[in-house]
């Protein structure tokens, strides 16, 4: 039998950020290779990453076709050097992944503060809208395009001279906050999907940006 020495994959795990989605598994192959299949609950299986010695497979191209579907993947194990033969009827060992629903489960990537501008005692902080690999017609969509009002941002800001943080929230990509004149402030933002009830509800914090550095402008 051609598959007697192969080991079924295990620990199948989805890794997904801003819809860039990779399936990972174990073990590192010894004398075997893998092929991945993916399908929706009602669809046909589609093969990807044919006879690979890797233990990961980028499935982004498949899931971005409909990020609101629920997907299932499976990983087949074959002997190294395996060539598809029409006469073989024996099914190779395989393992199923957990179900994965990109819209609910993709992690939010670390946001970036695009700019901040001070006018008197007000500062306008703008968050960069991240691009995803989700498409509409032939155009890539931004995170805001996909999530709309489901996506909010939280701004943390504090005087450079102290550690007491204040917060603000917006369902756009802009904040307008009050600041004390003559004080320098630092900013960090976090993307949040309030409707989620799981650990992937929030992104990691953006890099800190402080007034007096190149991203900012000041006008009296």
């Amino acid at each position: 039998s051609g598959t007697t020495n192969t080991v079924a994959a295990y620990n199948l795990t989805w890794k997904s950020t801003n819809f860039k989605t990779i399936l990972e598994w174990e073990p590192k192959p010894i004398n075997q290779v893998y092929t991945v299949q993916i399908s929706t609950k009602s669809g046909d299986w589609k093969s990807k990453c044919f006879y690979t010695a890797d233990t990961e497979c980028d499935l982004t191209d498949e899931i971005v076709k409909d990020v609101k579907q629920t997907y299932l993947a499976r990983v087949f194990s074959y002997p190294a050097g395996h060539v598809e033969s029409t006469g073989s009827t024996e099914e190779p060992p395989y393992e199923n992944s957990p179900e994965f629903t990109p819209y609910l489960e993709t992690n939010l990537g670390q946001p970036t503060i695009q700019s901040f501008e001070q006018v008197g005692t007000k500062v306008n902080v703008t968050v960069q809208d991240e691009w995803t690999l989700v498409r509409r017609n032939d155009t890539f969509l931004s995170l805001r395009d996909v999530f709309g009002k489901d996506l909010i941002y939280t701004l943390y800001y504090w005087k450079s001279s102290s550690s007491g943080k204040k917060t603000a929230k917006t369902n756009t990509n802009e904040f307008l906050i009050d600041v004390d004149k003559g004080e320098n402030y630092c900013f960090s933002v976090q993307a949040v999907i309030p409707s989620r009830r799981t650990a992937n509800r929030k992104s990691t914090d953006s890099p800190v940006e402080c007034m007096g550095h190149e991203k900012g402008e000041s006008r009296e």
Epitope: L104, R144, N171
Partner: antibody, heavy 120, light 113 residues
Framework: EVQLVQSGAEVKKPGESLRISCKGS????????IEWVRQMPGKGLEWMGD????????NYSPSFQGHVTISADKSISTAYLQWSSLKASDTAMYYC?????????????WGQGTLVTVSS | DIVMTQTPLSLPVTPGEPASISCKSS????????????LTWYLQKPGQSPQLLIY???TRESGVPDRFSGSGSGTDFTLKISRVEAEDVGVYYC?????????FGQGTKLEIK
């Protein structure tokens, strides 16, 4: 084919409780918001609130908060709108609708409506 | 809450003629992140459920005839019908789909002269 099928017309008395339903089919129920919209006789559309069945997260219009409860049972792809104590002013047509695929892209599919009549 | 104001409230039109409905919002519906206006238009034909016509202020929903077009940005929006047909009668609603609570305009009744 995406479909939203609502429960039938109801005639109730003031003070009674009621739950109406909206069953979704032809799509992944857990990932689309279900919206509830009221239309009083001869009047316009009023947004009441919504629910994302995958998480159970809800939003309510301040005009309806505390008077109605929105819920969903994802195992049977059904959303609910309920009242614990009806008033005559709740007499209206109630529509459920499903959000569009993209963010903030409107209510793409609508149920046929459930007529609720509250009268003593 | 964002208040949506439509004009006119009644619009008698001769078949084959154009029609225009205005919708103004009390706050901007322009999303700074992606420069999209979250303004939606619906038509409710007599005795029917509402149907989606246009989202993102100017994007026609699949299956909607191209005689319907939406335009505008910020707080001022317009729905135009290039040549009204008898089947276009009903009440047209604009909607704030930008922020909660979602709010509708009071409706514009289009009727055939």
């Amino acid at each position: 084919e995406v479909q939203l099928v609502q429960s039938g017309a109801e005639v109730k008395k003031p003070g009674e409780s009621l739950r109406i339903s909206c069953k979704g089919s032809g799509y992944t129920f857990i990932t689309y918001w279900i919206e509830w919209v009221r239309q009083m006789p001869g009047k316009g559309l009023e947004w009441m609130g919504d629910i994302l069945p995958g998480s159970g997260s809800t939003n309510y219009s301040p005009s309806f908060q505390g008077h109605v409860t929105i819920s969903a049972d994802k195992s049977i792809s059904t959303a609910y709108l309920q009242w614990s104590s009806l008033k005559a002013s709740d007499t209206a047509m109630y529509y459920c609708a499903r959000s569009g695929y993209y963010g903030n892209s409107g209510f793409a599919y609508w149920g046929q409506g459930t007529l609720v009549t509250v009268s003593s | 809450d964002i208040v949506m104001t439509q004009t006119p409230l009644s619009l008698p039109v001769t078949p084959g003629e154009p029609a225009s409905i205005s919708c103004k919002s009390s706050q901007s519906l322009l999303s700074s992140g992606n420069q999209k206006n979250y303004l939606t238009w619906y038509l409710q034909k007599p005795g029917q459920s509402p149907q989606l016509l246009i989202y993102w202020a100017s994007t026609r929903e699949s299956g909607v005839p191209d005689r319907f077009s939406g335009s505008g940005s910020g707080t001022d929006f317009t729905l135009k019908i290039s040549r009204v047909e008898a089947e276009d009668v009903g009440v047209y609603y604009c909607q704030n789909d930008y922020t909660y609570p979602l709010t509708f305009g009071q409706g514009t009744k289009l009727e055939i002269k």
